[in-house]
């Protein structure tokens, strides 16, 4: 069906009017472009209210919509092959008669993420509550429709017409009809303002009787920002009525002859207009030209006006609207500059923070501060930065290079750095004997002891560890049998390191080699066991191919 | 969780078509735009377009002249991709893409992609 | 259509060295609409960086991305043997999506 019944509300500069009918989003915004309109904007909670209104005037006319949950077109749109974009108020939709990107908004939930598709955006409406002034109608996105396939529950749309100006409504100062035709093609009889370039048809007296007079006018721009009806004098007066019929039409105070004629007047302070009803201020200021936040002054003698703007705004070219200035032009920041509506604000790259000498000044953040340290070990303020470093025997580790990793020298890219046995440990290492082999004065070497196959020389006591300075007490250590003294061959047993209790002791299990007694020459690989914390240190499986045992209380692959 | 599923390797003659399937499981199917990019042996990779399935509506890789065809079944959750008057140079593997809960076409999901093989 | 060049076409660094990738536009791009995808041999591309400088879920923070206009960026600052792999740009600012000719990071 096409656009049925319609509802109008002409307010500011502007005319809204609603429409019932299932129709297209393309199809409404024809209809409303046929009259020279477009569909609606929605661009401040001032706005919603006005078609607020105008779509209430519609349901009161209309019998019954046939959705409880009604959608009207509205001019917001999102073109086919545009996303969806959130960081927007109107997430990438736009007018569709132009114009720039508004901050208000009114989203009825989260939108659909598409690009593909042309979007359009309804109001909807729950016709079951009443339409409040603080429950303006949420703004729904969907496919725009087609001939015969509008979408679901879409119920009609709303137009809007814009104009440079309005004329009042005319004022009767007796029995009469007046009937405004608008540009756009809407007949109306009650009109708040009435737009430019329409007609009023007044037809005075009761109806009834034949000496009906009829009066034509048209809403003209008499001079700039200017608009009235080219009418002198109340219409329709009647000596009948006096001043009691409609205050005969006058804007203020009504005067009445003796002979039944009656005249208009203005109170203190105001004048009469040349259409010799409407009263006007004879201040400038009262009838606020200023717009966007800018206060009228008056000129001297009360004669003109300028307007002037609040901080952080300046006049546009009108003079009489105020804009935003971008204070950031001037770079009053040290590093980062914000415009922001009224003023500005500064802000800090990462690495700094607001402060030191002057406005809008940065200081380094001092991340190696107590308590906000983000190294595990040392760490270095540097400007913006920091760096981390690890004490000795530890590099640096982890993603973001903060953590610190134990080395371990049993492995070292340098070989290894005992004569037999090595021992990992955090931070540190130390070495060990095969049987029959004792630890020399330096730690590193063995030298023959006597001749028994007793249990290996462990972790030495605290006195004997040969710890770099700053390590800390091993809490895991892997036996690595590297070089057997005097040229024996190496053997390297690769081993895992099972999850242990912390409290675990560090221990020594008996090691028995298939050697002649003592004789270093010759001595079979040695394969390492770990003792699993529940049970304690144990006699490693395999007999006689065995070597020192160990609790081992660090995690796997981690120290 | 999201997942994409394509239909197996394909081998077809010159002239003839190939209609490759992508099953969506783990979201909403009509929620989300079902894109298709193809990768040419030892090539980069090509967008050759895609399709809404709440609304049927299409954008197409000109490249393709025609060619190929996108369409959805809502009922089972299946994207098609249908590709006509196949020559050598359409040996590729075609992936089916979208997007997800990220904005600005950043293909977050990937089907496995299907071989065609154009031979004669 | 915008054409995407990536450079260089193959960089072989050893482990541990900083990787930077170039991807130049034919003409400006929105920062928004320029993405990044990791594809492994025999493995379908996944999404490494979007919208410039967000990496995706599951992606190690060494990767970083970078860039506005026409010139973007993707930095791998300390390589590890599994970021072998070609790395491709994509944009898009109207149809066709374009993707860039990829970069072959190999271990050295």
């Known amino acids: 069906t096409g656009a049925d019944t319609e509802a109008v509300v002409c307010v500011g500069t502007a005319c809204y009017t609603a429409h019932s009918g299932k129709l297209s989003a393309a199809e409404a915004q024809n209809h409303c472009n046929q009259n020279g309109g477009n569909l609606a904007t929605v661009k401040s909670k001032e706005e919603a209210q006005h078609v607020q209104r105008v779509l209430a005037q519609l349901l009161r006319r209309e019998a019954a919509l046939t959705a409880r949950m009604s959608k009207f077109w509205i001019g917001l749109q999102r073109e086919k092959g545009k996303c969806l974009d959130p960081s927007l108020p109107l997430k990438g939709f736009s007018w569709v008669g132009g114009g720039e990107d508004t901050p208000y908004s009114n989203w009825h939930k989260e939108l659909r993420n598409s690009c593909i598709s042309k979007r359009c955006v309804s109001l909807l409406l729950d016709l079951s509550q009443p339409l409040l002034p603080s429950r303006l109608p949420k703004w729904s996105e969907g496919p725009c429709g087609s001939p015969g396939s509008p979408g679901s529950n879409i119920e009609g749309f709303v137009c809007k017409f814009s104009f440079k100006g309005m004329c009042r409504p005319l004022a009767l100062g007796g029995p009469g009809q007046v009937t405004y035709t608008t540009p756009f093609q809407t007949t109306s009889s009650s009109l708040e303002a009435v737009p430019f370039a329409s007609a009023a048809n007044v037809a005075c007296g009761e109806g009834d009787k034949d000496e009906t007079q009829s009066h034509y006018f048209l809403c003209k721009e008499k001079a700039p920002d200017v608009f009235d009806w080219g009418s002198s004098g109340p219409l329709c007066v009647s000596p009948k009525y006096g001043c009691n019929f409609n205050n005969g039409g006058c804007h203020q105070d009504c005067f009445e002859g003796g002979d039944g004629s009656f005249l208009c007047g203005c109170r203190p302070g105001f004048r009469l207009l040349d259409d010799l009803v409407t009263c006007a201020s004879r201040n400038p200021c009262s009838s606020s030209p200023c717009r966007g936040g800018a206060t009228c002054v008056l000129g001297p003698h009360g004669k003109n006006y300028t307007c002037r703007c609040p901080q952080g705004y300046q006049l546009d070219s009108s003079q009489l609207d105020c804009v935003d200035v971008d204070e950031c032009q001037d770079s009053p920041c040290a590093q980062e500059c914000v415009n922001t509506p009224g003023g500005f604000r500064c802000e800090c790259w990462v690495g700094y923070e607001p402060g030191g000498p002057g406005e809008g000044a940065c200081q380094d953040v001092d991340e190696c501060a107590l308590g906000r340290s983000p190294c595990a070990q040392g760490c270095t303020n540097t400007d913006g930065s920091f760096h981390c470093s690890c004490e000795e025997g530890y590099v640096l580790a982890g993603e973001d290079g903060t953590q610190c990793q134990d080395v371990d020298e049993c492995v070292g890219p340098g070989g290894p750095l005992c004569d037999s046995l090595c021992f990992n440990t955090q931070g540190s290492f130390h070495c060990g004997c095969l049987p029959g082999w004792v630890l020399a004065p330096n730690g590193v070497s063995c030298t023959m002891g006597p001749v028994s196959l007793g249990p290996p020389s462990g972790p030495p006591d605290e006195e004997d560890k040969g710890e770099k300075e700053g390590s800390t007490v091993p809490r895991a250590a892997t036996a690595s049998p590297t070089r057997g003294p005097e040229g024996t061959p190496k053997a390297t047993p690769t081993t895992s390191r099972p999850s242990l209790s912390s409290d675990a002791p560090i221990t020594s299990a008996p090691l028995k080699m298939l050697a002649p007694s003592g004789s270093p020459g010759v001595w079979r690989e040695p394969s390492i066991h770990h003792a699993t914390a529940a049970s304690g240190p144990q006699e490693p499986a395999g007999g006689d191919s065995s070597v020192a045992t160990q609790n081992n209380d660090g995690t796997d692959g981690q120290k | 969780q999201v997942q994409l599923v394509q239909s197996g390797a394909e081998v077809k003659k010159p002239g003839a078509s190939v209609k490759v399937s992508c099953k969506a499981s783990?979201?909403?199917?009509?929620?989300?735009?079902m894109h298709w990019v193809r990768q040419a042996p030892g090539q980069g990779l090509e967008w050759m377009g895609g399709?809404?399935?709440?609304?049927?509506?299409?954008a197409y890789n000109q490249n393709f002249k025609g060619r190929v065809t996108m369409t959805t079944d809502t009922s089972t959750s299946t994207a098609y991709m249908e590709l006509r008057s196949l020559t050598s140079d359409d040996t590729a593997v075609y992936y089916c893409t979208n997007y997800g809960n990220l904005y600005y076409y950043a293909m977050d999901y990937w089907g496995q992609g299907t071989s065609v093989t154009v031979s004669s | 259509e915008i054409v995407l060049t990536q450079s260089p076409a193959t960089l072989s660094l050893s482990p541990g060295e900083r990787a930077t990738l170039s991807c130049r536009a034919s003409s400006s791009v929105s920062s928004s609409y320029l993405h990044w995808y990791q594809q492994k041999s025999g493995a379908s591309p996944r999404l490494l960086i979007y919208s410039t400088s967000n990496l995706a879920f599951g992606i190690p923070a060494r990767f970083s991305g970078s860039g506005s206009g026409t010139d973007y960026t993707l930095t791998i600052s300390s390589l590890e043997a599994e970021d072998v792999a070609v790395y491709y740009c994509q944009q898009y600012s109207g149809y066709p999506l374009t993707f860039g000719g990829g970069t072959k990071v190999e271990i050295k």
């Open positions: 399709i809404d399935p709440e609304t049927g509506d299409t």
């Open positions: 783990g979201y909403t199917f009509t929620d989300y735009e």
